[in-house]
Interface confidence: low
Amino acid sequence: AVNGTSQFTCFYNSRANISCVWSQDGALQDTSCQVHAWPDRRRWNQTCELLPVSQASWACNLILGAPDSQKLTTVDIVTLRVLCREGVRWRVMAIQDFKPFENLRLMAPISLQVVHVETHRCNISWEISQASHYFERHLEFEARTLSPGHTWEEAPLLTLKQKQEWICLETLTPDTQYEFQVRVKPLQGEFTTWSPWSQPLAFRTKPAALGKDT
């Protein structure tokens, strides 16, 4: 038997990927482990090999199909098992009956770009990636802007309570370098969480016109 506490957490990206992290205190070393996905109403099943991400946690991605294919629905239940090899047998180490649309974490927004920049404001747009058409417009976003001399953790969060894939940042300082990030979350799902932050978009405001009062 393996001693210690085990935690097995998985999220569905709403299309064709389930990402899982398994952590185990006092876990087995040098043992091959995998996640096995067994849907209740689908003909397929899928496995992925758990790879170490720290001393006591492992992660893997269950690739269910083409990135934009809709592999699961709101009525699906997928039994997810952590299986570790013990000699010639596979031992169940952790298990959950996973409701994909209750455990959503979308991919980070992509294609961030500056639409228009001025001295004090900047209009930025982005796109969501691999998000299910089931959500329609039921998404929300958080954005943050990194100012010179500050950290991301200090940046105030701007909340967009609707599916709005653009923002107009205002009260910016002229001729200043900024970075911008955005993340997305569906409104659906009891255990749904925010996507990772997007890759930062760097931009610079225009300098103030000479002789003008700014």
Epitope: A1, V2, S6, D40, I77, T79, R81, R89, W90, R91, V92, M93, A94, I95, Q96, D97
Partner: nanobody, 123 residues
Framework: QVQLVESGGGLVQAGGSLRLACALS????????MAWFRQAPGKGREFVAS????????DYVASVQGRFTVSRDNNKNTVYLQMNSLKPEDTAVYYC????????????????WGQGTQVTVSS
């Protein structure tokens, strides 16, 4: 060391009901597919019902299908066998079994066993 302890057996009249319970200790319960077997006097041990680790899939021998229901409570480390419409031919010692390999639960020699609980059905 894994231990299984059954309870709930007894004497019941034909047509009556009993609920057996089996508690697992010494390991993590959700690692195990659980099953019930029975052994009537002078006969071999036979498979009755099983439930997979998640509780989602159950399996029954034909003779108890529709009368017996196997279930589990992963928070209580316990598996149950609800027995309705009991018949005299259900009289046996009922054994709880556990196996971490859910493909092997019907295999008599690879399971961990409880000590058994007597069920007697009188006519």
């Amino acid at each position: 060391q894994v231990q299984l302890v059954e309870s709930g057996g007894g004497l019941v009249q034909a047509g009556g009901s009993l609920r057996l319970a089996c508690a697992l200790s010494g390991d993590v319960f959700v690692r195990y597919t659980m099953a019930w077997f029975r052994q009537a006097p002078g006969k071999g041990r036979e498979f009755v019902a099983s439930v997979t680790d998640s509780g989602r899939t159950t399996d029954y021998v034909a003779s108890v299908q529709g009368r017996f229901t196997v279930s589990r409570d992963n928070n209580k480390n316990t598996v149950y066998l609800q027995m309705n419409s009991l018949k005299p031919e259900d009289t046996a010692v009922y054994y709880c079994a556990a196996n971490t390999d859910y493909f092997q639960i019907r295999s008599l020699d690879r399971n961990t066993w409880g000590q058994g609980t007597q069920v007697t059905v009188s006519s």
